[in-house]
């Protein structure tokens, strides 16, 4: 059995109330295991977007190597985040708004060389990190898809897919597809090329749209396409609205595999106040699908806190020296260095959640059931067969609340126990590992809880 621990019990007469009972072999045999679903690598954990390689390097001493080579020096860090794939770039040559001077087969020398890229691919492979290349053509320009020359661009993309697949990339991303005429048919064609090369390759499409109908129409003709959008950023950050968005999406897409993020490219801090970052990390890592983050999400990187930094791509804060532009602007607790050394930091939470997400069957591919709870709360269960089960309770509100979990909403296969062990809280102060009575559960403002409980036959 995959990971299942069937405890074998010796049955005594006492257990049987003193009576002699005949117990058939069938009664003693462990229940049959549910067949495991086929899982691709992008099902097994988070994706990490590095849209701007230069910003990711940091300023100062971090900026010693060309960005692609510099990224190679950060792979151990990415391994420590337990992310499964790296969404990189765009890094191709693109003269703003000039189709003729846009070459999807050539790396812009500002980022490094093809040799650097090949070396990055090799190093990433050794560390089991997949590399997805963003091929959004006119990334420096106004319209990402040169709206007037769609066919020329589409041909360039086709050639690029074939070229980079041969070079060894694990997938592709194209963004701003709301600006691409006939997006559905182009995506279908690009998906065919990608999957034709290998079923193990991934195509990600990104849109700024938050409209469910538009999203569904893109997904309709594209099985296995992973789509990032602004769908969840419309939640107004309330529990009820978030719950309805999530459940609506899952129902509308027929529970097909999806991705979870707040946008196709931007940082979580663009949409969320600091006090909700932990809550959203917990949610994104525990919903059924692939969580997708942008570099810096793990430390709460916030462009607004860094004078002169662009909102869409602020400098990554490795340590206090990463932003020498304004002395004193960066404190230790804003950096990877400072947060790595603090078990209570956002980064430490990210690492723990990512670890759970990549190893627990119920989180890897378990069923999902949302159910009613107190106002402002969003709660759900993740479970798979006889594996450990998870209960997530999220308080989006500004006030402490009784959880008020309505277990009657749940199917028999996903019933709640009286108590569950606290795996983690997004807030300090709770004793991890302690059993909590679910009927008496109270949450602090903006608190999220991840609880675990065993399967019970």
């Amino acid at each position: 059995h995959h990971h299942h621990h069937h405890e074998q019990k010796l049955i005594s007469e006492e257990d049987l109330g003193g009576e002699q009972k005949l117990i058939s072999e069938e009664d003693l045999r462990a229940p049959r295991c549910r067949e495991l679903p086929a899982q691709k690598w992008w099902h097994t954990g988070a994706l990490y977007r590095i849209g701007d390689l230069q910003a990711f390097q940091g300023h100062g001493a971090g900026n010693l190597a060309a960005p692609i080579s510099g990224l190679k020096g950060r792979l151990d860090y990415l391994s420590s985040l337990k992310v499964k794939g790296l969404v990189l770039g765009p890094i191709h040559k693109n003269q703003k708004d000039d189709v003729a001077q846009t070459d999807l087969l050539q790396i812009d020398p500002n980022f490094g060389s093809k040799e650097d890229f090949d070396s990055l691919l090799q190093s990433a492979k050794k560390k089991s990190i997949r590399v997805i290349l963003d091929l959004t053509p006119n990334y420096r320009g106004e319209n990402s898809w040169f709206s007037t020359q769609v066919d020329t661009v589409a041909t360039k993309v086709k050639d690029a897919l074939e070229f980079w697949l041969q070079a060894g990339v694990d997938g592709f991303q194209v963004r701003d597809i709301e600006n691409l005429k006939d997006a559905s048919s182009f995506l279908a064609e690009w998906q065919n090329i990608t999957k034709g090369f290998s079923e193990d390759r991934l195509l990600i499409a990104g849109t700024n749209s938050s409209d469910l109908q538009q999203i569904l129409s893109l997904l309709e003709s594209n099985k296995d396409l992973l789509l990032t959008s602004s769908y969840l950023s419309d939640s107004g950050s309330t529990g009820e609205h978030t719950k309805s968005l999530v459940t609506q999406y899952l129902n509308a897409t027929g529970n097909r595999w999806c991705s979870w993020s707040l946008s196709q490219a931007r940082l979580l801090t663009s949409f969320l106040p600091a006090q909700l970052l932990r809550l959203y990390q917990l949610m994104l890592f525990t919903l059924p699908g692939t969580p997708v983050f942008s570099y810096g999400d793990e430390i709460g990187l916030d462009a607004a806190a860094l004078p002169g930094q662009p909102m869409e791509a602020p400098v990554m804060l490795w340590d206090e020296s990463s932003f020498p532009d304004i002395p004193g602007a960066v404190s230790a607790n804003m950096t990877v260095k400072g947060q790595s050394e603090d078990p209570g930091s956002l980064l430490s939470l990210f690492r723990r959640l990512s670890d759970q997400r990549s190893k627990e069957r119920s989180l890897l591919h378990g069923d999902f059931h949302a159910f009613s709870a107190g106002p402002g709360l969003f709660s759900y269960i993740r479970h798979w067969d006889q594996n450990e089960r998870f209960l997530v309770v999220l308080n989006f509100g500004d006030v402490g609340l009784s959880a008020g979990l309505q277990a009657s909403d749940l199917p028999a296969s996903a019933s709640l126990p009286a108590k569950a062990d606290l795996l983690l809280s997004t807030q300090p102060g709770r004793e991890e590992g302690s059993p909590l009575e679910l009927e008496r559960l109270k949450l602090e403002p903006h608190e999220g809880l991840l609880l675990r409980f065993p399967y019970a036959a």
Epitope: G60, A61, G62, S113, W318, K337
Partner: antibody, heavy 123, light 108 residues
Framework: QVQLVESGGGVVQPGRSLRLSCAAS????????MHWVRQAPGKGLEWVAL????????YYTDSVKGRFTISRDNSKNTLYLQMNSLRAEDTAVYFC????????????????WGLGTTVTVSS | DIQMTQSPSSLSASVGDRVTITCRAS??????LNWYQQKPGKAPKFLIY???SLQSGVPSRFSGSGSGTDFTLTISSLQPEDFATYYC??????????FGQGTRLEIK
């Protein structure tokens, strides 16, 4: 194969100047930050200076600031160290090396050293 | 600046011995520590990065451990070619990069 070869060392009087060169081959020189490290006779290793891949960032150990200048010519795959106002305590074997970036959580697998060139400052 | 202190400064050992060299940083450097081996008249050779990761091509008898301020380099069974000087080096944050003063390992 990956190689760094230093040249330009020699015997020089205190107060005079010397320019060291380091020729790189076997890797994309223009993609890596480069360092100079020295070793005085019978002593340990001392980091001297570093330069970023494109020459835009330069750093020096305190004892050489204002006297030494690190530079590079990526078209020639060559690293330089211009040493002015030399002192007796600058006497050492000078190595050029690619060591990676001294920032948190950065680990370079591109760690290459030359064989060194000897600088002797003596009157 | 971060100071690196190695101990012992020198030690004598025999082929087949297990040898441990320690390195202490004046402040926490997480795991940003490298180890080098240098033979007389030669350039230093990179052995271990990130405190415990073996550089490719380095024999598995070499191992590194530690985090924060205290680190060790262990050679599980000394070979004749291992007699050399060993240096630790921190690359934790912002120049300067600093090396330990070295540990000379000689044949007993």
């Amino acid at each position: 194969q990956v190689q760094l070869v230093e040249s330009g060392g020699g015997v020089v009087q205190p107060g005079r100047s010397l320019r060291l060169s380091c020729a790189a081959s076997g890797f994309t020189f223009s993609s890596y930050g480069m360092h100079w490290v020295r070793q005085a006779p019978g002593k340990g290793l001392e980091w001297v200076a570093l330069i970023s891949y494109d020459g835009s960032n330069k750093y020096y150990t305190d004892s050489v600031k204002g006297r030494f200048t690190i530079s590079r010519d990526n078209s020639k795959n060559t690293l330089y160290l211009q040493m002015n106002s030399l002192r007796a305590e600058d006497t050492a074997v000078y190595f050029c090396a690619s060591l990676g970036a001294p920032t948190y959580s950065y680990f370079s697998d591109m760690d290459v050293w030359g064989l060194g060139t000897t600088v002797t400052v003596s009157s | 600046d971060i100071q690196m202190t190695q101990s012992p400064s020198s030690l004598s050992a025999s082929v087949g011995d297990r040898v441990t060299i320690t390195c202490r940083a004046s402040q926490s450097i997480s795991s940003s520590l490298n180890w080098y081996q240098q033979k007389p008249g030669k350039a230093p050779k990179f052995l271990i990065y990130a405190a415990s990761s073996l550089q490719s091509g380095v024999p598995s008898r070499f191992s590194g451990s530690g985090s924060g301020t205290d680190f060790t380099l262990t050679i599980s069974s000394l070979q004749p070619e291992d007699f050399a000087t060993y240096y630790c080096q921190q690359s934790y944050s912002t120049p300067p990069i600093t090396f330990g003063q070295g540990t000379r390992l000689e044949i007993k």
